[in-house]
């Protein structure tokens, strides 16, 4: 049975030009996480194995960064980086945890933090 | 005690195949990644590719893309690479090494691949 | 890829010697760096794992230390049995890669 839960950054937004973090959390499982994928929609951002480190899609290596930690760094922010993006936990024995967090990149000097939630 | 145990190595002709063998004991093989590295003659390692244990998903030097294929075999505890398109170039003895948290800590005894005409 | 150089290439020593090899990355690494011995005709052995970390078995003799891009392995007191081609790995980002190698010879 699948007991674990992820934590994530939940809703955030960030300038543009700017960087964000994203961020999450596996817990409540004693499973073993052989890998992280960050996806953006239906496109692999990056990759962090477990054994081998992390992988990131050409077309990203520009503007993306390895971690910190299972985490991942946008950088130089377009407006066209709003939406959703996945963290999926690849574990055994239990299976595949996602956690979805959404980003809007806005054009003005204020951006806000939204608040942490889990899904199960 | 680990123990892995590399086969199937030997001469091949260039453009020709071969398939290495790597049998584990002393651990629980399907909790591990796996890698395959190689030396060629009087040079140092280069790592060859990657198989998780439970997924199965593979990651492969770009030197051997396409080329070469791994596969584990969870039921006997083996590994496997097979080797298609041999170059000269391919020439090197082949190590298969359990992968843990970023190194290669136990490895075997390795196995010489020779592609000559 | 990240390029992993290390220095020297060879060095001579003699039994007792403080021994120290570097690596550099070619960009960083954070802590994700493994040190190899390897003697003629046998496989390489795991001596320090994540920079500093002493593999199960390995004597203390050997220590790492270092973090983004610049690592050393120092052995404190050079044994008959020590003499040996070491290697550095990084693991952080794929393709896993080595250093060159470091020969320590007898001096």
């Known amino acids: 049975m699948m007991t674990g839960t992820i934590e994530t950054t939940g809703n955030i937004s960030a300038e543009k030009g700017g960087s964000i973090i994203l961020q999450c959390h596996l817990s409540s499982t004693t499973a073993q996480v052989t890998q992280v994928n960050w996806e953006q929609q239906d496109q692999l951002l990056a990759i962090c194995n477990a054994d081998l480190g992390w992988h990131i899609s050409p077309s990203f290596k520009d503007r993306v960064a390895p971690g910190p930690g299972l985490g991942l760094t946008l950088q130089s922010l377009t407006v066209n980086d709003t939406g959703e993006y996945f963290c999926i936990y690849h574990t055994y024995p239990d299976g595949t945890y996602t956690g979805r967090i959404f980003l809007e990149v806005l054009e003005s000097s204020v951006a806000e933090h939204g608040a942490r939630f889990q899904i199960p | 005690e680990v123990q892995l145990l590399e086969s199937g190595g030997g001469l091949v002709q260039p453009g020709g195949s071969l398939r290495l063998s790597c049998a584990a004991s002393?651990?629980?093989?399907?909790?591990?990644?796996v890698s395959w590295v190689r030396q060629a003659p009087g040079k140092g390692l280069e790592w060859v590719g990657y198989?998780?244990?439970?997924?199965?998903?593979?990651y492969y030097a770009d030197s051997v893309k396409g080329r070469f294929t791994i596969s584990r075999d969870n039921s006997k505890n083996t590994l496997y690479l097979q080797m298609n398109s041999l170059r000269a170039e391919d020439t090197a003895v082949y190590y298969c090494?359990?992968?843990?948290?970023?190194?290669?800590?136990?490895w075997g005894q390795g196995t010489l691949v020779t592609v000559s005409s | 890829d990240i390029q992993m150089t290390q220095s020297p290439s060879s060095l001579s020593a003699s039994v007792g010697d403080r021994v120290t090899i570097t690596c550099r990355a070619s960009?960083?690494?954070?802590?994700?760096l493994n040190w190899y011995q390897q003697k003629p005709g046998k496989a390489p052995k795991l001596l320090i794992y994540?920079?500093?970390s002493l593999h199960t078995g390995v004597s203390s003799r050997f220590s790492g230390s270092g973090s983004g891009t610049y690592f050393t392995l120092t052995i404190s007191s050079l044994q008959a049995e020590d003499f040996a081609t070491y290697y550095c790995?990084?693991?952080?980002?794929?393709?896993?890669?080595f250093g060159q190698g470091t020969k320590v010879e007898i001096k």
């Open positions: 090494a359990r992968s843990y948290g970023g190194g290669f800590d136990y």
């Open positions: 002393g651990f629980t093989f399907s909790n591990y990644g």
């Open positions: 198989i998780n244990p439970s997924r199965g998903y593979t």
């Open positions: 960009q960083t690494i954070e802590r994700r």
């Open positions: 994540d920079a500093s």
């Open positions: 790995q990084q693991s952080y980002i794929i393709p896993p890669t």
